[in-house]
């Protein structure tokens, strides 16, 4: 039975040209995290494998940095980066947990962070 929950940074906004940290946290389970995949609308951004470390997709090498922790840092943001991001936690023995973050990249300097929320 999957008892865990994923807490994410929720709906967030950031300025064009700036950076943002995407963070997810798995709680309420003793399952072992074997890998975390980061996706943007079905496109792979990065993989953090517990044994083998990080892989940043070649398409994003120049703008994506691993961490902090299992999170991901997006740099040199453009308005095209607006959209949904997913952290996919592969765990044993529970299986897969998925968290969703919506990022809005704003032209102006009025970028505020949204509230945190949970996905069971």
């Amino acid at each position: 039975m999957m008892t865990g929950t994923i807490e994410t940074t929720g709906n967030i906004s950031a300025e064009k040209g700036g950076s943002i940290i995407l963070q997810c946290h798995l709680s309420s389970t003793t399952a072992q995290v074997t890998q975390v995949n980061w996706e943007q609308q079905d496109q792979l951004l990065a993989i953090c494998n517990a044994d083998l470390g990080w892989h940043i997709s070649p398409s994003f090498k120049d703008r994506v940095a691993p961490g902090p922790g299992l999170g991901l840092t997006l740099q040199s943001l453009t308005v095209n980066d607006t959209g949904e991001y997913f952290c996919i936690y592969h765990t044993y023995p529970d299986g897969t947990y998925t968290g969703r973050i919506f990022l809005e990249v704003l032209e102006s300097s009025v970028a505020e962070h949204g509230a945190r929320f949970q996905i069971p």
């Epitope: 995949n37 792979l44 070649p58 398409s59």
Partner: antibody
């Protein structure tokens, strides 16, 4: 011991499709990429595309994107490369290879299958 | 796409002599985060599958003799066989795995003079 074992040689008609398999053993299949490379007779190596089974992420060479499909079956640790609308110039040896593209090891295509000869002829 | 240009196309070297193969990429292969160049070298003997020799420009794959060495950074790379042996007769390919699509050089055929 890491091994990649490919399916046997194929003879196909122009316009048809071919599906080549690559069975992996000796490592955790989900953790590494499987890439496909072809080599026409007397020619060099050409990268077709790859798949990461631990998420089924695929990447294709634009040259083949409309005609190739790469899949993986984690239950059997087998990757597949299907090429459609075959023409004579697709006659080549098709190789699968394990890819290690982690930022801390990065060993590229470190293990290769034995190759599968696909002949396209009317 | 990153274009990989190898030179020479073929090379005839006496046994025990040095063989040098060059590979030039159309874009830098240096990844700033880990300061590694995503460049590999493969050896392919007649009738065989390619075999990984060197990755990250200069790291020898396990079991590869130390007469094989790689060097370079950015866009210019070299594979050196310090003392050619009969079993080294093969075609050698460089490959970039920095960005999609991964691309190979045209190959260099090494023969005994």
């Amino acid at each position: 011991e890491v091994q990649l074992v490919q399916s046997g040689a194929e003879v196909k008609k122009p316009g048809s499709s071919v599906k080549v398999s690559c069975k992996a053993s000796g490592y955790t299949f989900s953790n590494y990429w499987i890439g496909w490379v072809r080599q026409a007779p007397g020619q060099g190596l050409e990268w077709i595309g790859d798949i990461y089974p631990g998420g089924a992420y695929t990447n294709y060479n634009e040259k083949f994107k409309d005609r190739v499909t790469i899949t993986a079956d984690k239950s059997t640790s087998t990757a597949y490369m299907e090429l459609s609308s075959l023409r004579s110039e697709d006659t080549a040896v098709y190789y699968c290879a394990r890819g290690d593209y982690y930022d801390s090891s990065g060993r590229a295509m470190d293990y290769w299958g034995q190759g599968t000869l696909v002949t396209v002829s009317s | 796409d990153i274009v990989m240009t190898q030179s020479p196309d073929s090379l005839a070297v006496s046994l025990g002599e040095r063989a040098t193969i060059n590979c030039k990429s159309s874009q830098s292969l240096l990844y700033s985060r880990n300061q590694m160049n995503y460049l590999a070298w493969y050896q392919q003997k007649p009738g065989q599958s390619p075999k990984l020799l060197i990755y990250w420009t200069s790291t020898r794959e396990s079991g590869v003799p130390d007469r094989f060495s790689g060097s370079g950074s950015g866009t210019d790379f070299t594979l050196t066989i310090s003392s050619l042996q009969a079993e080294d007769v093969a075609v050698y390919y460089c490959q970039q795995y920095y960005s999609y699509p991964y691309t190979f050089g045209g190959g260099t055929k090494v023969e005994i003079k």
